[in-house]
């Protein structure tokens, strides 16, 4: 039975040209996290395997940095980066847990700075 829950940064916003940290946290389970996949709708951004390290998709390699931890740092944000992002936790023995983050990239400097994991 899957008892875990994923906490995410929820809905966040950031300024165009800036950076943001996408972060999820799996709690309430003793399952072992074997891998976390970061995806944006139908695209793979990155994979962090607990043992094998990171894979960054070539289309994002210049704008994505691994970490901190199992999180992902998105850099040089554009308005096109607005949308849903998913952290997919592969665990043993539970299976797969998915968390959702919605990122809004704003043109102006009125981006909210309330997100827990956001880079100023």
């Amino acid at each position: 039975m899957m008892t875990g829950t994923i906490e995410t940064t929820g809905n966040i916003s950031a300024e165009k040209g800036g950076s943001i940290i996408l972060q999820c946290h799996l709690s309430s389970t003793t399952a072992q996290v074997t891998q976390v996949n970061w995806e944006q709708q139908d695209q793979l951004l990155a994979i962090c395997n607990a043992d094998l390290g990171w894979h960054i998709s070539p289309s994002f390699k210049d704008r994505v940095a691994p970490g901190p931890g199992l999180g992902l740092t998105l850099q040089s944000l554009t308005v096109n980066d607005t949308g849903e992002y998913f952290c997919i936790y592969h665990t043993y023995p539970d299976g797969t847990y998915t968390g959702r983050i919605f990122l809004e990239v704003l043109e102006s400097s009125v981006a909210e700075h309330g997100a827990r994991f956001q880079i100023p």
Epitope: Q35, N37, E39, L44, L52, W54, S57, S59
Partner: antibody
């Protein structure tokens, strides 16, 4: 240039163990994950597992968990794959191969080591 | 485990032909797919990574496409030196798995 040079062919009896080595040169062994892939005669490639020499993490295919052991001697720039409790179905060519920097595709391969298990 | 089904298993074509090989994953793997070429008695060589990126030094006649579960590998104009077996490989999640291979022969 990057090179992965493997140890020579081995003939083993069922129940025995084999240890294959893979000497890396042309790059720093701790910078790339090393994997082991085998190919039985006429069969598809089969991933055994991988080891991250930087932090020592290992990931094994469930099929080989407990029977395969991956290690790295960073001072000798050499990776090892030991397979125990050998059976005839383990007769195959064993390859070491490294994954690209920050990618999981396998960009350099050793020449392969033939392991024959026969009584 | 993710199953990779490659087709056809063998293929005979003439020099200059356009050759297409397909690979189907048993679940969505996004673009976590590579293609390799293996000649008899030799180790595989990386041709395509992340579904569509040509590896360094690989001739432009080789290309890859696809995302999700369906992938295609194409040789735009077959050359005699392309005679080999081609494999797809998923690295979306462990255990990493390979297709059954496509053996390419010249007519």
């Amino acid at each position: 240039q990057v090179q992965l040079v493997q140890s020579g062919a081995e003939v083993k009896k069922p129940g025995a163990s084999v240890k294959v080595s893979c000497k890396a040169s042309g790059y720093t062994i701790t910078e790339n994950t090393m994997h082991w892939v085998r190919q039985a005669p006429g069969q598809r490639l089969e991933w055994i597992g991988g080891i991250n020499p930087n932090q020592g993490g290992t990931s094994y295919s469930q099929k080989f968990q407990g029977r395969a052991t991956l290690t790295v001697d960073t001072s000798a720039s050499t990776a090892y794959m030991e397979l125990s409790s050998l059976r005839s179905e383990d007769t195959a060519v064993y390859y070491c191969t490294r994954s690209s920097y920050y990618r999981y595709d396998l960009d350099y391969w050793g020449q392969g080591t033939t392991v024959t298990v026969s009584s | 485990d993710i199953q990779m089904t490659q087709s056809p298993s063998s293929l005979s074509a003439s020099v200059g032909d356009r050759v297409t090989i397909t690979c189907q994953a048993s679940q969505d793997i996004k673009t976590a797919l590579a293609w390799y070429q293996q000649k008899p008695g030799k180790a595989p060589k990386l041709l395509i990574y992340s579904a569509s990126y040509r590896y360094t030094g690989v001739p432009s006649r080789f290309s890859g496409s696809g995302s999700g579960t369906d992938f295609t590998f194409t040789i735009s104009s077959l050359q005699p030196e392309d005679i080999a077996t081609y494999y797809c490989h998923q690295h979306y999640t462990t255990p990493w798995t390979f297709g059954g291979g496509t053996k390419l022969e010249i007519k």
